[in-house]
Structure formats: structure tokens, C-alpha cells
């Protein structure tokens, strides 16, 4: 297990922002809706790298698009409430990376749905806290 | 130190709903993610689905979507897990458990005519 | 939805015996396994996390293997109070799912 509480606290604040991911893409999974279809059609841009906290930069610039999308999804059997999840993915984040970061995102050629845009992300997660495990 | 206590064993009738209460103690209420976990008499383990309790959103096992309704009081640091349309097979033990190392002891609920 | 298939479903065993028990995930989940031990009337307790990381207190005789599909309990030695059932878990896509459960008796 981690050892020092600065690793403790990234490694928490990742679980959490990879539960918020998983969360949603459970949500886009469950969605048996017209919308869905709608939702498959929106682009988001995927990070050329992510292989460290200050590629979560990318994920950041995403977060709006991110919202608007699943701002299409609200209905009784759509249990994500969008700005707050958001807003809590968007805190988690900037602790993560580091509100000073001047770091540059560089982006893919390829754009992706929001299922691969998800998928990107929840395996970047999963990757950096099994490294520090 | 920490810990989650359910409230007690519940008998309701079929297409009756139950809400199970798990109020958390010992730790930051909001710091950590809640899953419910289901258990029929003699059989496995049924993740139902989980919710993050600062802001209240929730995301459900597909099974269970649109009967459950999970819900959170930051005021008394607890969380509620509410199944509608109950029937017979819904008759089993649930749980809550917080980062997965720490669980309440279980309510039964029994679904009966 | 990732299953997960435990194995055997039952095993006899006595106190100091050498127990295995296998988890096969039906898709590739990394490390991301736990190994629970349940008794009768209680709720669930967590073992092992991250496919070998040994939760706090639990004894050293318990350990975890594997990654991607495969994985493995064993308990070196096994004492009176680990007659039980063991669950595995996979906790890298939701929904979360368990293995069906591993009673270990006493022969």
C-alpha cells in the first residue's frame, strides 16, 4: 500500500475520479434511449499521450463537451446529475494535475465517441494507480 | 473508529417498497463512495449499484434500474437504499460497503404474502 | 457484464492443509481483483485487493496471484477459523460483479 499521505491522497483522488468515469460510461451502458444514438455522434478529442497527472490536461479541456452530452441524456432512468458530476470530475482533476500546470495538450488525429473517450480515460486511471499500489 | 450501521430487518408485502438506511461513522462521510451489495439466502453476492455521497449522484446495476433509488443525508452522515415493485425474489440481506473495506452488518428483508 | 467463475464451488480440507482457490474473469480485468472470506450470518470480509495486496490485518498465511483472466487464493496453512466462503470480485468495469463463492469445509 502507498506509503507517504501525498501518494495516498492521488491514489484516492484517482479512485475517485475513475469510479465518476466508470460511473458515467455505467449510465451510457444501462441508456436504452433514442438519445444514445444522438450521444454516439458527438467527437471528443482524445490526448496523443496519457501516461501522466499532467496529461489529465486533456481530460480537463474535455469536460464541457462532456457535460453537454450527457445534458442530452436527463430522464428518469438517467441518474447522473451532469453539472455535478462534472463539477466534482473538474475539482478532482485540478488537484490531480496541479491548478499551476502550464502543460500543453496534444491531441490525437482521431476523434473518438464519448464510450471510447471514457474508456481512454478509465484505463488511464486504472493504469497509474496500479503503479502505485 | 470506523463503521456503518444498517437499520433492522424489514417484512413487506409483494409490490410493496423497502428503504434501508447504512449511516456511516468514524470517517469524512463524504470522502468515500457507497455501493450496495445484495445476498439471497444461500447464494452469492449482487452488486446493486453505488452513489457518491457529496453530490448525491448514483449509477445502478442495470438489473435493478428504475426500482432502486439510492439517496444520501450529509446532515446525519447517512445513506438510503429505497426498492420499489418488491417481489418474492427480492427477499435477501443487503449491504452497504464504503471503499470496499468496511461494510455495514447486513438488514434482511424478507418479501412475503 | 464481466463474469467471473470460481473454482471448485466446495472443497474439504483440514486445519494446516495447503488451499487453492481459482478465479477466471471472462475478459481481461489487469489486477483489478479482490478476494473476500464470508461467514455465516456476516457480511463480507476483504482479504485481498489488487489481486495480491493483503488488506490491513488480514493474516500472512493468505495470499493472491495473478492478472489479465487468471487468478489464485491460497492459504498456506489453513486454521480453524478460516472455514468459509471465499468470493472473488472484479472491480475494472461496472457493473461490479462476484465469482459464485468457494465453501471451504472441514474433512
Known amino acids: 500500500a502507498p506509503t507517504s499521505s501525498s501518494t495516498k491522497k492521488t491514489q484516492l483522488q484517482l479512485e475517485h475520479l475513475l469510479l465518476d468515469l466508470q460511473m458515467i460510461l455505467n449510465g451510457i451502458n444501462n441508456y436504452k434511449n433514442p438519445k444514445l444514438t444522438r450521444m454516439l455522434t458527438f467527437k471528443f478529442y482524445m490526448p496523443k499521450k496519457a501516461t501522466e497527472l499532467k496529461h489529465l490536461q486533456c481530460l480537463e479541456e474535455e469536460l464541457k463537451p462532456l457535460e453537454e452530452v450527457l445534458n442530452l441524456a436527463q430522464s428518469k432512468n438517467f441518474h447522473l446529475r451532469p453539472r455535478d458530476l462534472i463539477s466534482n470530475i473538474n475539482v478532482i482533476v485540478l488537484e490531480l494535475k496541479g491548478s499551476e500546470t502550464t502543460f500543453m495538450c496534444e491531441y490525437a488525429d482521431e476523434t473518438a465517441t464519448i464510450v471510447e473517450f471514457l474508456n481512454r480515460w478509465i484505463t488511464f486511471c486504472q493504469s497509474i494507480i496500479s503503479t502505485l499500489t | 473508529q470506523v463503521q456503518l450501521v444498517q437499520s433492522g430487518a424489514e417484512v413487506k408485502k409483494p409490490g410493496a417498497s423497502v428503504k434501508v438506511s447504512c449511516k456511516a461513522s468514524?470517517?469524512?462521510?463524504?470522502?468515500?463512495?457507497m455501493h450496495w451489495v445484495r445476498q439471497a439466502p444461500g447464494q452469492g453476492l449482487e452488486w446493486m449499484g453505488i452513489?457518491?455521497?457529496?453530490?448525491?449522484?448514483?449509477s445502478y446495476a442495470l438489473k435493478f434500474q428504475g426500482r432502486v433509488t439510492m439517496t444520501r443525508d450529509t446532515s446525519t452522515s447517512t445513506v438510503y437504499m429505497e426498492l420499489s415493485s418488491l417481489r418474492s425474489e427480492d427477499t435477501a440481506v443487503y449491504y452497504c460497503?464504503?471503499?470496499?473495506?468496511?461494510w455495514g452488518q447486513g438488514t434482511l428483508v424478507t418479501v412475503s404474502s | 457484464d464481466i463474469q467471473m467463475t470460481q473454482s471448485p464451488s466446495s472443497l474439504s480440507a483440514s486445519v494446516g492443509d495447503r488451499v487453492t482457490i481459482t478465479c477466471r474473469a471472462s475478459?481481461?480485468?489487469?489486477?483489478?481483483l479482490a478476494w473476500y472470506q464470508q461467514k455465516p450470518g456476516k457480511a463480507p470480509k476483504l482479504l485481498i485487493y489488487?489481486?495480491?495486496s493483503l488488506d490491513e490485518g488480514v493474516p500472512s498465511r493468505f495470499s493472491g496471484s495473478g492478472s489479465g483472466t487468471d487468478f489464485t487464493l491460497t492459504i498456506s496453512s489453513l486454521q480453524p477459523e478460516d472455514f468459509a466462503t471465499y468470493y472473488c470480485?472484479?472491480?475494472?468495469?461496472?457493473?461490479?460483479?462476484f465469482g459464485q463463492g468457494t465453501k471451504v469445509e472441514i474433512k
Open positions: 460497503t464504503s471503499g470496499w473495506d468496511v
Open positions: 468514524g470517517y469524512t462521510f463524504t470522502r468515500y463512495y
Open positions: 452513489i457518491q455521497p457529496r453530490a448525491g449522484y448514483t
Open positions: 475478459q481481461s480485468i489487469s489486477t483489478w
Open positions: 489488487a489481486a495480491s
Open positions: 470480485q472484479q472491480s475494472y468495469s461496472f457493473p461490479v460483479t
